[in-house]
């Protein structure tokens, strides 16, 4: 399963789409910056087996997909870009699920790293709470878009490390 290679390409395409989605000048949103507490430590460990690592990345993509599939998201972003972005994420999720099934037969370790997945879930809960508190304002969404781009970039480093491990 060559997921790290295909996923890295998908990640790059998703990042490009995210970059194109901006609707307002980020300069007007500086005071809306927020610490979402990206769970960096969950993407630092070398202790993961491949299936576990993929399950953490899967959770991250799934949560991003959920976030950008809400009606509030649809009201904010340009529809065709949003659809392309969702399609890209969906393709990545399908690739990952197929890859995990392949890996399970190879590895003896548990399929999921529960603590890491929970940390990712909580991270996205903080993002959702922030959007709610900010009443889904354009600037709040702009801050979240920047955060998701950053988290994708950080997870890309994780994927590259995973590829080197193979």
């Amino acid at each position: 399963c060559d997921l790290p290679q295909t996923h890295s390409l998908g990640n790059r395409r998703a990042l490009i789409l995210l970059a194109q989605m901006g609707r307002i000048s980020p300069f007007s949103c500086l005071k809306d910056r927020h610490d979402f507490g990206f769970p960096q430590e969950e993407f630092d460990g070398n202790q993961f087996q491949k299936a576990q690592a993929i399950s953490v990345l899967h959770e991250m993509i799934q949560q991003t997909f959920n976030l950008f599939s809400t009606k509030d998201s649809s009201a904010t972003w340009e529809q065709s870009l949003l659809e392309k972005f969702s399609t890209e994420l969906n393709q990545q999720l399908n690739d990952m699920e197929a890859c995990v099934i392949q890996e399970v037969g190879v590895e003896e370790t548990p399929l999921m790293n529960v603590d890491s997945i929970l940390a990712v879930k909580k991270y996205f809960q903080r993002i959702t709470l922030y959007l709610t508190e900010k009443k889904y304002s354009p600037c709040a969404w702009e801050v979240v878009r920047a955060e998701i781009m950053r988290s994708f970039s950080l997870s890309k480093i994780f994927q590259e490390r995973l590829r080197r491990k193979e």
Epitope: A19, G22, S25, P26, F27, C29, L30, K31, D32, R33, H34, D35, F36, E142, V143, A146, E147, M149, R150, S153
Partner: antibody, heavy 121, light 107 residues
Framework: EVQLVQSGAEVKKPGESLKISCKGS????????IGWVRQMPGKGLEWMGI????????RYSPSFQGQVTISADKSISTAYLQWSSLKASDTAMYYC??????????????WGQGTLVTVSS | DIQMTQSPSSLSASVGDRVTITCRAS??????LNWYQQKPGKAPKLLIY???SLQSGVPSRFSGSGSGTDFTLTISSLQPEDFATYYC?????????FGQGTKVEIK
């Protein structure tokens, strides 16, 4: 290794034009904004303006609006600061520095080495 | 514009001293305050960001505190290499603004 490398010192006459540069390396250039800071001889730091290299959106300090132009060429990971007509009062050290944009990350964590601009007749 | 006022503008201290520099914003800036150190002929160096976060590679003798309008940079035990000028800077809103600087000199 993250680096911002600025162009060399310049000596110019009043009324001349000038464009100085700041080249970023070791990171994704379009993921960070680039700010420009002036330091006149023996004085403190003054923020001039900032650019988002991903789309060349800019924001200037009111004190520098109309006095300078900030631009960027993302294809060569370089930001620029330019003057169309220099004055003696533009004599200063100019620094570029990277800014994380809307991300909760350290502001101006890497700086260029500075470009000394001397304007004298 | 948000005005940043540092005090004192200069101070004399000895190696081993505890040094405190304050910075006051003309309006609330939450915790969007950074501290920089600058030595003669060198570019500024980030020490503290978001009021109290220590920048990677900066010695733990440097610490920052405060929120709203009043902020403090503390050097717990001054070292020879700490003699420099220190600047605060607000990153709450544009235009970004710096304090006028505090020069820390050898007594």
């Amino acid at each position: 290794e993250v680096q911002l490398v600025q162009s060399g010192a310049e000596v110019k006459k009043p009324g001349e034009s000038l464009k100085i540069s700041c080249k970023g390396s070791g990171y994704s250039f379009t993921s960070y904004w680039i700010g420009w800071v002036r330091q006149m001889p023996g004085k403190g730091l003054e923020w001039m303006g900032i650019i988002d290299p991903s789309d060349s959106d800019t924001r200037y300090s009111p004190s520098f609006q109309g006095q300078v132009t900030i631009s960027a060429d993302k294809s060569i990971s370089t930001a620029y600061l330019q003057w169309s007509s220099l004055k003696a009062s533009d004599t200063a050290m100019y620094y570029c520095a990277r800014h994380p944009g809307l991300n909760w990350a350290p502001d101006f964590d890497y700086w260029g080495q500075g470009t000394l601009v001397t304007v004298s007749s | 514009d948000i005005q940043m006022t540092q005090s004192p503008s200069s101070l004399s201290a000895s190696v081993g001293d505890r040094v405190t520099i304050t910075c006051r914003a003309s309006q609330s800036i939450d915790r969007a305050l950074n501290w920089y150190q600058q030595k003669p002929g060198k570019a500024p160096k980030l020490l503290i960001y978001f009021a109290s976060s220590l920048q990677s590679g900066v010695p733990s003798r440097f610490s920052g505190s405060g929120s709203g309008t009043d902020f403090t940079l503390t050097i717990s035990s001054l070292q020879p290499e700490d003699f420099a000028t220190y600047y605060c800077q607000q990153s709450f809103d544009f235009p970004l603004t710096f304090g006028q600087g505090t020069k820390v000199e050898i007594k």
